[in-house]
C-alpha cells in the first residue's frame, strides 16, 4: 500500500477520504486506526456503526468522526480541532470477523496556523512537502508519500 499524505492546519478540521470497492467490501464495517511505531500494531480510534445498514451515521470518538458511504464506496474520517499530536501514520480498515484489510495508509501532517503567532516549535513538518496531488477536501491537501520518504518523525 502506498501512503497518502493529508495535510491540515492546527485548530481546524481535516477530512480524510478512503475510497474502496463497494462490492468487494459489501456488508463490512470500517475502522480508522493509528499506527503505533513503524512495525507496531494499529490502535483502533473509531469504527463505523455496529449495524452495517447504518454505516452512514456519523460516529464520534473524542474529536474524531467516521462515516461510510457504503453504496458509493468512500469512507470519510474527520479530525476536528487538529492538534500537533494528531500527526502520524493511520490506516483506513475494512473489518471482517477478527481480521482487518487495509483500505489506505494515511500520513496526517499538521501545519501551523498562519494566523497563530505562538511558537510553532512543537509542530512536526516532514522533509518533502513540495509535491502535492490536487486533492483538496475541507482544509486538507493529500498526496502520495514520495519513495524513500519516512512516514514517522525521527526520534531524538
Amino acid at each position: 500500500h502506498n501512503t497518502t499524505v493529508f495535510q491540515g492546519v492546527a485548530g481546524q478540521s481535516l477530512q480524510v477520504s478512503c475510497p474502496y470497492d463497494s462490492m468487494k467490501h459489501w456488508g463490512r464495517r470500517k475502522a480508522w486506526c493509528r499506527q503505533l511505531g513503524e512495525k507496531g500494531p494499529c490502535q483502533r480510534v473509531v469504527s463505523t456503526h455496529n449495524l452495517w445498514l447504518l454505516s452512514f451515521l456519523r460516529r464520534w470518538n473524542g474529536s474524531t468522526a467516521i462515516t461510510d458511504d457504503t453504496l458509493g464506496g468512500t469512507l470519510t474520517i474527520t479530525l476536528r480541532n487538529l492538534q500537533p499530536h494528531d500527526a502520524g501514520l493511520y490506516q483506513c480498515q475494512s473489518l471482517h470477523g477478527s481480521e482487518a484489510d487495509t483500505l489506505r495508509k494515511v500520513l496526517v501532517e499538521v501545519l501551523a496556523d498562519p494566523l497563530d503567532h505562538r511558537d510553532a516549535g512543537d509542530l512536526w513538518f516532514p522533509g518533502e512537502s513540495e509535491s502535492f496531488e490536487d486533492a483538496h477536501v475541507e482544509h486538507s491537501i493529500s498526496r502520495s508519500l514520495l519513495e524513500g520518504e519516512i512516514p514517522f518523525p525521527p526520534t531524538s
Partner: antibody
C-alpha cells in the same frame, strides 16, 4: 393510504417454525428499509431485525438473541416482507410488528419507524 | 451495549398539565434518539425523531430535546387522548428501547 398488515401468527410448539408476512401498500416498497419488532405480553418493545431497501440489496441485520434462528426476506414484486422464525423458544412469545424505516433520500434513511402494522401474536407453548 | 434508562416508569397528571419524561443513555449517543407513543392494544406511533424533530402530523404539544446522554420528552398540555405508554429508542449502537413510561390521567 400507507399501510402495513401482518399475518401468520398463531400457536406453535417449542422447536418448531413459523413464517410471518407483512404486506405493504400505498408506498414504493423497494425504496424502504423494513424492520421487525416484538413485544412480549406486558413488556416493552424489542427490535428483532431489519432488511435493507433494494439499493442495499436487501442486506439484513438482526438482534443477537435471534441471529441464526430468524431470517428476514422481502419480495418486491408482491410488496411483502417476511420473518421466518425457526427453532422457536417460549421466550419468543410476543406480538410481532413490522415497521417502515423513515427515508431521507435514495441512499439515506433513519431508524425512526414511521409506519407500523397492527401486529400479530405468536405464542410458543407446548 | 447501550442501556436506556427511562423515568419515571409511570406518572399521573391532570388534563392541561405539562408532562416531562426523561431518557438517559449509558454513553453518548449524539442525537440518535426517537420517541414513540403506544396506546393499549395498538402499535407504536412515531412522535419525535433525531431527538427533537416532530414527525409530520403529530400535534405541536409534543416536543423533544437533549443530546449526548440526557434527553427529555415533553407534553406541554396533557390531553385525554395522550393516555398511553411512551418509549425512547436509541440507534447509536444498535436499536434499543427504554423501559417505557405509562401516562395516566388523575
Amino acid at each position: 393510504e400507507v399501510q402495513l398488515v401482518e399475518s401468520g401468527g398463531g400457536l406453535v410448539q417449542p422447536g418448531r417454525s413459523l413464517r410471518l408476512s407483512c404486506t405493504a401498500s400505498g408506498f414504493t416498497f423497494d425504496d424502504y428499509t423494513m424492520s421487525w419488532f416484538r413485544q412480549a405480553p406486558g413488556k416493552g418493545l424489542e427490535w428483532v431485525g431489519f432488511i435493507g431497501s433494494k439499493a442495499y440489496s436487501a442486506t439484513t441485520e438482526y438482534t443477537a438473541s435471534v441471529k441464526g434462528r430468524f431470517t428476514i426476506s422481502r419480495d418486491g414484486s408482491k410488496s411483502i416482507a417476511y420473518l421466518q422464525m425457526n427453532s422457536l423458544k417460549t421466550e419468543d412469545t410476543a406480538v410481532y410488528y413490522c415497521a417502515r424505516g423513515k427515508r431521507y433520500s435514495y441512499t439515506y434513511w433513519t431508524p425512526a419507524f414511521d409506519v407500523w402494522g397492527q401486529g400479530t401474536l405468536v405464542t410458543v407453548s407446548s | 451495549d447501550i442501556q436506556m434508562t427511562q423515568s419515571p416508569s409511570s406518572l399521573s397528571a391532570s388534563v392541561g398539565d405539562r408532562v416531562t419524561i426523561t431518557c438517559q443513555a449509558s454513553q453518548d449517543i449524539t442525537n440518535y434518539l426517537n420517541w414513540y407513543q403506544q396506546k393499549p392494544g395498538k402499535a407504536p406511533k412515531l412522535l419525535i425523531y433525531d431527538a427533537s424533530n416532530l414527525e409530520t402530523g403529530v400535534p405541536s404539544r409534543f416536543s423533544g430535546s437533549g443530546s449526548g446522554t440526557d434527553f427529555t420528552f415533553t407534553i406541554s398540555s396533557l390531553q385525554p387522548e395522550d393516555i398511553a405508554t411512551y418509549y425512547c429508542q436509541e440507534y447509536d449502537s444498535y436499536i434499543t428501547f427504554g423501559g417505557g413510561t405509562k401516562v395516566e390521567i388523575k
